[in-house]
């Protein structure tokens, strides 16, 4: 048995930040689980991990330098990514592993979410207008 995962097909990070919600066909309440977000078609980069344990506080971390936070719902984990760069535009995949109680469960690979990071194009308006021409 595999857990099914639903993600938005595309998200745009206008302010270099984005909320990506991973929705599961499984209730995570009172489970030990490891939810992770992976970057790239080959999921080579583990962007962020949310670890939940019925006896502990939720743990969120990144070993790959991403600024991330996580929020848990009964059947979802939302990853909040900040300080994203334009060159981090890519496809991102949600992964879920339930470690306890047995049996171990993981997900069918989802379709992923393309996160399009828009650069901040600042167009400074002059404080003082230049001399007007007659």
């Amino acid at each position: 048995n595999k857990i099914l995962v639903k993600q938005s097909p595309m998200l745009v990070a206008y302010d270099n930040a984005v909320n990506l919600s991973c929705k599961y066909s499984y209730n995570l309440f009172s489970r030990e689980f490891r939810a992770s977000l992976h970057k790239g078609l080959d999921s080579a980069v583990e962007v962020c991990v949310v670890y939940g344990n019925y006896s502990q506080q939720l743990q969120v971390y990144s070993k790959t330098g991403f600024n991330c936070d996580g929020k848990l719902g009964n059947e979802s984990v939302t990853f909040y990514l900040q300080n994203l760069y334009v060159n981090q535009t890519d496809i991102y995949f949600c992964k879920i592993e339930v470690m306890y109680p047995p049996p171990y469960l993981d997900n069918e690979k989802s379709n992923g979410t393309i996160i399009h990071v828009k650069g901040k194009h600042l167009c400074p308006s002059p404080l003082f207008p230049g001399p007007s021409k007659p």
Epitope: R34, Y61, Y104
Partner: nanobody
Framework: EVQLVESGGGLVQPGGSLRLSCAAS????????MEWYRRTPETQREWVAT???????NYPDSVKGRFTISRDDTKKTVYLQMNSLKPEDTAVYYC???????????????WGQGTLVTVSS
């Protein structure tokens, strides 16, 4: 990276016994839950036994009373004692461990390559 290596598989007659071992190595800070799973060409992964870091054990009905899981944390090894083996126990047996590599970081999941158990006369 954590590595898991299973051993102890082989050919055994129905009603016989085997003891499987799974040794963990690599950068291990702590071993948490350790488990055995099995797979045949016809079936999906099937859970066989679980032992938590506190020593609590769980088994599915199909092996309860015949199989016993145990662990030796000083050797970073988990064992599966299999008695009263049946032909339907024939499978590749895989070790699964939940382990922490670094203090302060949550654990990850690791799998061994498997060891073949054949029950046949």
């Amino acid at each position: 990276e954590v590595q898991l290596v299973e051993s102890g598989g082989g050919l055994v007659q129905p009603g016989g016994s085997l003891r499987l071992s799974c040794a963990a190595s690599g950068s291990i800070f702590r071993l948490h839950t350790m488990e055995w799973y099995r797979r045949t060409p016809e079936t999906q992964r099937e859970w066989v036994a679980t032992i938590t870091s506190g020593g609590t054990t769980n088994y599915p009905d199909s092996v309860k009373g015949r199989f016993t899981i145990s662990r030796d944390d000083t050797k970073k090894t988990v064992y599966l004692q299999m008695n009263s083996l049946k032909p339907e126990d024939t499978a590749v047996y895989y070790c699964h461990a939940v382990a922490t590599e670094d203090a302060g970081f949550p654990p990850s999941n690791y799998w061994g390559q498997g060891t073949l158990v054949t029950v046949s006369s």
